[in-house]
């Protein structure tokens, strides 16, 4: 759905809860442009992008909550997520330093739009909440009361221990994601709302 | 190899029904969801109605009143029955399937197509 | 619902050239999906996801946008690429398509 604005048909709503979960889950999209970027695309040092135990709710985790209580988690994950990828953002290299050192300008692109992309999504999940009538969840444009802070990178000077981070972040957030959609498939039918 | 086929079109009198039918094969509906879309001679694309794999049903706000969507998953035979036709019903009516098991409103398979003229 | 405004509404072009046919939305949306027709024929999918071919499109298609304003261009063409394109949405219900694009040979 546009930012904003809220479908009030709950399989296309869920369908677009699905698609966005479909492909966010791909690393293609961001860990692996990340990666390039980053000058991490070697064997020897992708051995050390693995995902930090507890940075994300692990599927398990989320499947134990309720409709209402999985929305508010991914809410407030989300918003975590959007701050780290702040951050991460500020550290990339600029488009011309890309090209400078021969590196794709479009891997660069799949990285920028990874926060309209989650804006997107967390957009869309606020307006289920609202179709479900969950009146606890916050606006997705404003701080939610209890949000977790994102996780913080660990203090250093050290810029290959930073990329190494992001990498570990956004590995974590593509098996999150994961994990996400395949509970939203889970969600399935609803009862049959089609004859307005 | 995936592939849908409708029949069931011909001319028919405003004011009379006609039941539309969209054989599926190479898949099977209750994976997927499929929908109705149709064209009028020499117009664009207009979607009609989606039945998924659960059998839930949506339709076009246009024209549901007069529309029912339904399947038969032991055929593999999707259906659309139209009640109270008009004139502006002519159209080539094409089932079209969506690409996962999801909640998918975009056509990755079409049948051919089955023209509806109605006329008296 | 959300119209889909698709311009022009004929493109006449030679094989070999680039096409580039234009798609608007009346509010934003998330993803664009483009389909060819050609005469007698059902539509085909393209592009899935605003830029993502679909499964045996060539690599000469391409899509790309965001919000209300959405491209989809054909690098070089190839005599079997002139038929009718059509955008479609489903960010918002219900789910609805372009005009058309009418690309013809020059």
């Known amino acids: 759905a546009a930012m904003g604005s809220c479908s009030k048909e709950y399989r296309m709503l869920l369908g677009q809860l699905q698609k966005q979960t479909d492909l966010m889950q791909d690393t293609s999209r961001l860990l692996d442009p990340y990666i390039r970027i980053q000058g991490l695309d070697i064997p020897k040092l992708r051995e050390h992008c693995r995902e930090s135990p507890g940075a994300f709710p692990s599927e398990e985790t989320l499947r134990g909550l309720g409709r209402r209580g999985f929305l508010q988690t991914l809410n407030a994950t989300l918003g975590c997520v959007l701050h780290r990828l702040a951050d991460l953002e500020q550290h990339l290299p600029k488009a011309q330093d890309l090209e400078r050192s021969g590196l794709n300008i479009e891997d660069l692109e799949k990285l920028q739009m990874a926060r309209p992309n989650v804006l997107g999504l967390r957009n869309n999940v606020y307006c289920m909440a609202q179709l479900l009538d969950n009146s606890d969840m916050t606006e997705p444009t404003k701080a939610g009361r209890g949000t977790p802070q994102p996780p913080t990178p660990t203090p250093t000077s050290d810029v290959f221990q930073r990329k190494l981070e992001g990498c570990s972040f956004l590995r974590g957030y593509h098996r999150f994601m994961h994990s996400v959609g395949r509970i939203f498939s889970k969600w399935g039918e609803s009862p049959n709302r089609s004859r307005r | 190899q995936v592939q849908l086929v409708e029949s069931g079109g011909g001319v028919v009198q405003p004011g009379r029904s006609l039941r539309l039918s969209c054989a599926a094969s190479g898949f099977s509906l209750t994976n997927y969801g499929v929908h109705w879309v149709r064209q009028a001679p020499g117009k664009g694309l207009e979607w009609v109605a989606v039945?998924?794999?659960?059998?839930?049903?949506d339709y076009n706000a246009a024209f549901m009143s007069r529309l029912t969507i339904s399947k038969d998953n032991s055929k593999n035979t999707l259906y659309l029955q139209m009640n109270s036709l008009r004139a502006e019903d002519t159209a080539v009516y094409y089932c079209a399937k969506s690409p996962n098991s999801n909640f998918y409103w975009y056509f990755d398979v079409w049948g051919r197509g089955t023209l509806v003229t109605v006329s008296s | 619902e959300i119209v889909l405004t698709q311009s022009p509404a004929t493109l006449s072009l030679s094989p070999g050239e680039r096409a580039t046919l234009s798609c608007s939305g009346s509010s934003s949306v998330s993803y664009m999906y483009w389909y060819q027709q050609k005469p007698g024929q059902a539509p085909r999918l393209l592009i899935e996801d605003t830029s993502n071919l679909a499964s045996g499109i060539p690599a000469r298609f391409s899509g790309s946008g965001s919000g209300t304003d959405y491209t989809l261009t054909i690098s070089n063409l190839e005599p079997e690429d002139f038929a009718v394109y059509y955008c479609?949405?489903?960010?918002?219900?219900?789910?609805?398509f372009g005009q058309g694009t009418k690309l013809e040979i020059k």
């Open positions: 479609q949405q489903w960010s918002s219900y219900p789910p609805t």
């Open positions: 039945i998924w794999r659960g059998g839930s049903t």
